[in-house]
Interface confidence: low
């Protein structure tokens, strides 16, 4: 079927650009804070398969490091996240960019969506926890409608800095509860949950506390379901994943839709070594095709016993009435000593079209 | 309607193998991942392993591997499970099952189940 | 691996009585799912992403939890609902079950 040459836009999120090849860039970012480094292809050309390197160790990816073809990200950054970062083609293993990256207890600056100045410490020797800027609290009700973002602040103070910590329903709340997780920046006291859906309704409290004392402040998130809407996909963590030559792989992507969605697992291939047909049109193989059941489908996609042909871009793709919605996911599959070690990409087999 | 129809009951001795069928209908066969479930006299359900029809791909309980093989033929839309070295250990009743159409981690629709009964 | 715990293990319920069975995780899964079986019969699907009902499952049953904790909850039990219940996750590899609760009409 044909579903129109819709324009794939990829929205990138606030993170640092790569520096040019040779120079190396000098980062500080604050304890806790995700650091988030991107190398874009030199000249905007392809760049092949590519693998993140620290002080000379390929990255492994886990739940906190996130490694894709052009970005890096590492969650809740610590001490022992200082270090140099490079990536390299894995081919000829060129370090592309180079970084050096210092994690400091102290705030990063900056990387505050709304631009606004961290509240300073008044200087009190001790005290409980008090909040900064009360008068942007009073919104206690939020009610936005679905695939918008949510952010929650708490800005607070005190001496020992207080901790901050978050409930969903009285209940703890952590980035596993959601499918699209949530981003906790402990320096500026916020809680932000991208692509809300309905079951993201509730009240949110923020509970901040040290040894002197505890306050707390709950907010109430109602989401409005637009109707009819094109489908609304949020990518399951990670998006982007490196695997070991025969495991397993999955990826995950939620689909919420009024009308009954047609969903598509796609795989990005090259016909007679070009990615696009000639309309400009991505070459895409069909992996999985299905019409969803439920207006609410937690989709996977399995990949059992990888090889290197494996690797490569794949995507989530949902279809209503409405509109397209779809999601890209990353695969990188490598030998199982090491992470540098060198692939070839191998060209696809089966039924192609350009989607 | 979609319907999953598995293989009769099988007696076996200890040490013998055996191979349960699971002939799928009513949907598209390699659309959708087979699941095996082994449910011991009076207990509860145990996942074996899954195997995905569209390119074969199998995972296992680590508990079943080695004791299960997974296997499928698409020109008959059929799902096989070998079972082999068995013991007592082994009599149970196995169910196949297929996930939920939209690719929930769940079993929307299962077999009537296949009683293997291991016996000297 | 998660290990699912049920409970009761074993309950009984008059007609028309509310009854909530529990499953508890020994880790924080994302969603739970539920089977109901009856003797000589293969489980059927009674609820999926923790509080969705599967298909002809009566609006008297329903789901919810999170974390560690889920139940279902049947407002006014009917004969019909006596059976065991198995709960079951797969946010981490293997995939379990719960032993069940085993609900029987008083």
């Known amino acids: 079927e044909s579903l129109g040459t819709e324009q794939r836009v990829v929205g990138r999120a606030a993170e640092v650009p790569g520096p040019e090849p040779g120079q190396q860039e000098q980062l500080v970012f604050g304890s806790g804070d995700a650091v988030e480094l991107s190398c874009p292809p030199p000249g905007g050309g392809p760049m092949g398969p590519t693998v993140w390197v620290k002080d000379g160790t390929g990255l492994v990816p886990s739940e906190r490091v996130l490694v894709g073809p052009q970005r890096l990200q590492v969650l809740n950054a610590s001490h022992e996240d200082s270090g140099a970062y490079s990536c390299r083609q894995r081919l000829t293993q060129r370090v592309l960019c180079h970084f050096s990256v210092r994690v400091t207890d102290a705030p990063s600056s900056g990387d505050d969506e709304d631009g606004e100045d961290e509240a300073e410490d008044t200087g009190v020797d001790t005290g409980a926890p008090y909040w900064t800027r009360p008068e942007r609290m009073d919104k206690k009700l939020l009610a936005v409608p679905a695939a918008n973002t949510v952010r929650f602040r708490c800005p607070a103070a005190g001496n020992p800095t207080p901790s901050i910590s978050w409930l969903k329903n009285g209940r703890e709340f952590r980035g596993e509860h959601r499918i699209g997780g949530i981003k906790l920046r402990h320096q500026q006291w916020s809680l932000v949950m991208e692509s809300v859906v309905p079951s993201d309704r509730g009240n949110y409290t923020c509970v901040v506390e040290n040894k002197f004392g505890s306050i707390r402040q709950t907010y109430t998130l109602d989401v409005l379901e637009r109707s009819p809407h094109r489908p609304i996909l949020q990518a399951g963590l990670p998006a982007n994943q490196t695997a070991v030559l025969g495991s397993d792989v999955e990826f995950h992507c939620k689909v919420y839709s009024d009308a009954q969605p047609h969903i598509q697992w796609l795989k990005h291939v090259e016909v007679n070594g070009s990615k696009v047909g000639p309309d400009g049109t991505p070459y895409v193989t069909v992996l999985k095709s299905w019409i969803s059941e439920s207006v609410e489908a937690d989709v996977r996609l399995r990949l059992a016993n990888v090889s290197e042909r494996d690797g490569g871009e794949y995507l989530c793709r949902a279809t209503n009435f409405i509109g397209v919605a779809e999601k890209a996911f990353w695969l990188s599959v490598h030998g199982p000593r090491a992470a540098e070690e060198e692939l070839v990409e191998a060209d696809e087999a089966g039924s192609v079209y350009a989607g | 309607e979609i319907q999953l129809q598995q293989s009769g009951p099988e007696l076996v001795k200890p040490g013998a193998s055996v191979k349960v069928s699971c002939k799928a209908s009513?949907?598209?066969?390699?659309?959708?991942?087979m699941y095996w479930v082994k449910q011991s006299h009076g207990k509860s359900l145990e996942w074996i392993g899954y195997?995905?029809?569209?390119?074969?791909?199998?995972r296992y309980n680590q508990k079943f591997k080695g004791k299960a093989t997974l296997t499928v033929d698409k020109s008959s839309s059929t799902a096989y499970m070998h079972l082999n070295s068995l013991t007592s250990e082994d009599s149970a009743v196995y169910y196949c099952?297929?996930?939920?159409?939209?690719?929930?981690?769940?079993?929307?629709?299962w077999g009537q189940g296949t009683l293997v009964t291991v016996s000297a | 691996q998660i290990v699912l715990t049920q409970s009761p293990a074993l309950m009984s319920a008059s007609p028309g009585e509310k009854v909530t069975m529990t499953c508890s995780a020994s880790?924080?899964?994302?969603?739970m799912y539920w089977y109901q079986q009856k003797p000589r019969s293969s489980p059927k699907p009674w609820i999926y992403?923790?509080?969705n009902l599967a298909s002809g499952v009566p609006a008297r049953f329903s789901g919810s939890g999170s974390g560690t904790s889920y139940s279902l909850t049947i407002s006014s039990m009917e004969a019909e609902d006596a059976a065991t219940y198995y709960c079951?996750?797969?946010?981490?590899?293997?995939?379990?079950f719960g032993a069940g609760t085993k609900l029987e009409l008083k």
């Open positions: 992403l923790t509080s």
């Open positions: 099952a297929r996930e939920g159409g939209n690719y929930e981690a769940w079993f929307a629709y």
């Open positions: 079951q996750q797969w946010s981490s590899n293997p995939l379990t």
């Open positions: 195997i995905d029809p569209y390119n074969g791909g199998t």
């Open positions: 880790s924080s899964v994302s969603y």
């Open positions: 009513g949907y598209a066969f390699t659309s959708y991942n």
